[in-house]
């Protein structure tokens, strides 16, 4: 799987988990969440080459496509496959609210 | 939805579905599948501009990241998202088979 | 320079729907917690809801829970109100405003709002 | 819901005269949870004053806001002609948002 297990501890170019930290103030401009002050979020991304961890027939026949048409432009891309939610705390004024935000953390990826 | 309806209408630079045709033999050599001799299989592709068709809260989160971090290579990226299956006609020997294959057809795309 | 620009309002019987648009441009629309406030005719000023952009958490004012529905695209920096079943005392000019960045907070920029009439 | 009571309703001064405003909640809002916005005939309301005691910016230095727990107070040191309109208060403590009913500042 192309997770933090595998990506993290390899030098990867073709798609695969990569680390980003999220500061919600700082990068979203969020100042309604009061815990936690941000996240590894992490992301998807590299090449997809022939078969790499293509994950429908679709982008394995389109996979196949571009090994014998190097010319088209029609090739799989990397994109997250697994999500988690983020727990959060906010505050409805004077009152703490804690919600469940779900698919915020992408714990692995796959070429689509 | 980035669906056929939409996308082979408009010109559409952003992330949309691509008419894509696939001869069996001509572009993936196979000469196994007697019928059809190929299908229309599209495609995604085109940019992921803020927002665009995001499909998950991860990928809303980083497309609002990447507005405020322009600088920043963490975006979503144009995908599959509905697919059908491909009814074909194959012979075993002499004995002519029929079998759906699953996610051969992209329908519609999204940025994930 | 922020700017919120609302449209929709009309005249419109009792039982019947509405959608007004908030249209946001001059910042990074999703950083901020969006709400609705109207105002009756000669009255003064009553919150009607709030939705929290990108994640979609939204609350409303009793008077209206049921009956109303905020939302928003992201994408187009547009704020919408869907308004049905609609009652004689929903006719106010209606303001989306936007907050400091709490959720609940003091309101920092307001559209120049747009008048909502139900009558028969 | 937090009832904001303000007072007085109407308030006759002249220009250059001292303006004193005030809003009383019917429960605790705390230090920092009140604000208060200036409406003009056929205008959107305008933040003035946010967490009780903060300046928005572009406000003039005239308007300042005091006050904690269920006492506040807006005051403005020298009335300007501008400045005659109707002030609301307003609670985020507590959900819902709830406003006052509004004092109007006349030109007496």
């Known amino acids: 799987a192309l997770d933090a297990a595998y990506c993290f501890r390899n030098v990867q170019d073709n798609c695969c988990l990569r680390p980003l930290y999220i500061d919600f103030k700082r990068d979203l401009g969020w100042k309604w969440i009061h815990e936690p002050k941000g996240y590894n979020a992490n992301f998807c991304a590299g090449a997809c080459p022939y078969l790499w961890s293509s994950d429908t027939q679709h982008s394995r026949v389109l996979s196949l496509y571009n090994t014998i048409n190097p010319e088209a432009s029609a090739s799989p891309c990397c994109v997250s496959q697994d999500l988690e939610p983020l727990t959060i705390l906010y505050y409805i004024g004077k009152t703490p609210k804690i919600e469940q935000l779900s698919n915020m953390i992408v714990k692995s990826c796959k070429c689509s | 939805a980035l669906d056929a309806a939409y996308c082979f209408r408009n010109v559409q630079d952003n992330c949309c579905l691509r008419p894509l045709y696939i001869d069996f033999k001509r572009d993936l050599g196979w000469k196994w599948i007697h019928e059809p001799k190929g299908y229309n299989a599209n495609f995604c592709a085109g940019a992921c501009p803020y927002l665009w068709s995001s499909d998950t809260q991860h990928s809303r989160v980083l497309s609002l990241y990447n507005t405020i971090n322009p600088e920043a290579s963490a975006s979503p990226c144009c995908v599959s998202q509905d697919l059908e299956p491909l009814t074909i006609l194959y012979y075993i020997g002499k004995t002519p088979k029929i079998e759906q294959l699953s996610n051969m057809i992209v329908k519609s795309c999204k940025c994930s | 320079d922020v700017q919120l620009v609302e449209s929709g309002g009309d005249l419109v019987k009792p039982g019947g729907s509405l959608r007004l648009t908030c249209v946001a441009s001059g910042y990074t629309f999703s950083s901020n917690v969006m709400h609705w406030v109207r105002q009756a005719p000669g009255k003064g000023l009553q919150w009607v809801a709030y939705?929290?952009?990108?994640?979609?958490?939204?609350y409303y004012a009793d008077s209206v829970k049921g009956r109303f529905t905020i939302s928003i695209d992201n994408s187009k920096n547009t704020l919408y109100l869907q308004m049905n079943s609609l009652k004689t005392e929903d006719t106010a000019t209606y303001y989306c405003a936007r907050t400091l960045g709490l959720v609940l907070d003091a309101m920092d920029y307001w559209g120049q709002g747009t008048l909502v009439t139900v009558s028969s | 819901e937090t009832v904001l009571t303000q007072s007085p309703g109407t308030l006759s001064l002249s220009p250059g005269e001292r303006a004193t405003l005030s809003c009383r909640a019917s429960q605790s809002l705390g230090s920092s949870y009140l604000a208060w916005y200036q409406q003009k005939p056929g205008q959107a309301p305008r933040l003035l004053i946010y967490?009780?005691?903060s300046r928005a910016p572009g406000v003039p230095a005239r308007f300042s806001g005091s006050g904690s727990g269920t006492d506040f107070t807006l005051t403005i040191s020298s009335l300007e002609p501008e400045d005659f309109a109707v002030y609301y208060c307003?609670?985020?403590?507590?959900?819902?948002?709830?406003f006052g009913q509004g004092t109007k500042l006349e030109i007496k």
């Open positions: 939705v929290i952009p990108i994640v979609d958490i939204a």
């Open positions: 307003q609670q985020y403590a507590d959900s819902p948002i709830t």
């Open positions: 967490g009780a005691s």
